[in-house]
Amino acid sequence: LIIGFGISGRHSITVTTVASAGNIGEDGILSCTFEPDIKLSDIVIQWLKEGVLGLVHEFKEGKDELSEQDEMFRGRTAVFADQVIVGNASLRLKNVQLTDAGTYKCYIITSKGKGNANLEYKTGAFSMPEVNVDYNASSETLRCEAPRWFPQPTVVWASQVDQGANFSEVSNTSFELNSENVTMKVVSVLYNVTINNTYSCMIENDIAKATGDIKVTESEIKRRSHLQLLNSKAS
């Protein structure tokens, strides 16, 4: 969480951002809130990115002002116009690119004063894993598959029955480049699987951590997946 305060002349206002991560090829949110103003026409929102000459986005007098928007963000940004009046300056970024990563500044001007806060935005790819039972040559294995990751993650298997066991010797993980030549499909196979046990496949890079759990019994197989973004710090 980053909380910024305005400086000089006018009073300062509090602006708060939250470090976040974007999934490349999907839409992302750069989060920013501020002390609201009663008049929309008095609010100016500017989003800037370190190292980029033009603006990322500008909203003033109740509408977008994109004449100075940098080319790399053309047609890809929007604020939540109906929520600006209540202090939401968050930016929606369409079709997140790897190059969108960096330090952004959310700069706010209202009738009460000015304020800004920085935001670290990471980009990569992350997806939910699915764990299934595979069967070939009369032996059972578990196959953990996740369609899109970047940068290359680590994959670790764990088991409820054999807590603390190292499964690296009885598992095999491969990374297959997807057609857009950036993200990769993750496939990890665990051998020597026993029934009446719960196994977890944990996939992690510096952006996200995902877990696929599978509980195998004779009568049913229970599966669940979780995805957690890392380093969501507020400023």
């Epitope: 039972v133 004779e218 009568s219 049913e220 197989i221 229970k222």
Partner: antibody, heavy 114, light 107 residues
Framework: EVQLVQSGAEVKKPGSSVKVSCKTS????????MHWVRQAPGQGLEWIGE????????NYNQKFKGRATLTVDKSTSTAYMELSSLRSEDTAVYYC???????WGQGTTVTVSS | DIQMTQSPSSLSASVGDRVTITCSAS??????LNWYQQKPGKAVKLLIY???RLHSGVPSRFSGSGSGTDFTLTISSLQPEDFATYYC?????????FGGGTKVEIK
């Protein structure tokens, strides 16, 4: 005795939604996942999804993701399946089935017709 | 999705006959296969789970066998109450899929 009692038959217009209930008794509701399966007239069985009543974790059949919504009410030990944007092909008998699909409800007939 | 192919789709048999229904999976599912019985207007009943385990209360004339991709349900001596439709279902992979059903009719 394990029992799954489903709500009555429904007739719906295309584009509308239907919500089918499944009231359970005779076992600990939160200890078993609940499955939903449907059967179109003269057809086989088709799995819609499953929900863990303890925390409402859900696995959907991708075919129904976005249209089917599975929920539970732990206070009444009841599971629900809502299907939106109904079309004529959704005309079917809808079943709830406990845990490892060992006990099934009697089925709810949903007819979609203009 | 895993395709489950059941055969025959229907059969005629007499009381006392031995009846065999087969189910084939499009890929290996180990032993994660159930068999169900469905009668018109009645709740579906689980007969067999994990290929060959008899569900509680199911008569011993029902048995299941197989592994991998090919499975069989056998009724050793058909009884009047056994005339129904039978379904296989795999639970190895999501989404769980069913066979098309086999209707057992009186000859």
């Amino acid at each position: 005795e394990v029992q799954l009692v489903q709500s009555g038959a429904e007739v719906k217009k295309p584009g509308s939604s239907v919500k089918v209930s499944c009231k359970t008794s005779g076992y600990t509701f939160t200890s078993y996942w609940m499955h939903w399966v449907r059967q179109a007239p003269g057809q086989g069985l088709e799995w819609i999804g499953e929900i863990d009543p303890s925390d409402s974790y859900i696995n959907y059949n991708q075919k129904f993701k976005g249209r089917a919504t599975l929920t539970v009410d732990k206070s009444t030990s009841t599971a629900y399946m809502e299907l939106s944007s109904l079309r004529s092909e959704d005309t079917a008998v809808y079943y709830c089935a406990r845990g490892p699909r060992d006990y099934w409800g009697q089925g709810t007939t949903v007819t979609v017709s203009s | 999705d895993i395709q489950m192919t059941q055969s025959p789709s229907s059969l005629s048999a007499s009381v006392g006959d031995r009846v065999t229904i087969t189910c084939s999976a499009s890929q290996g599912i180990s032993n994660y296969l159930n068999w169900y019985q469905q009668k018109p207007g009645k709740a579906v009943k689980l007969l067999i789970y994990y290929t060959s385990r008899l569900h509680s209360g199911v008569p011993s004339r029902f048995s299941g066998s197989g592994s991998g991709t090919d499975f069989t349900l056998t009724i050793s001596s058909l009884q009047p109450e056994d005339f129904a439709t039978y379904y296989c279902q795999q639970y190895s992979k999501l989404p769980y899929t069913f066979g098309g059903g086999t209707k057992v009719e009186i000859k």
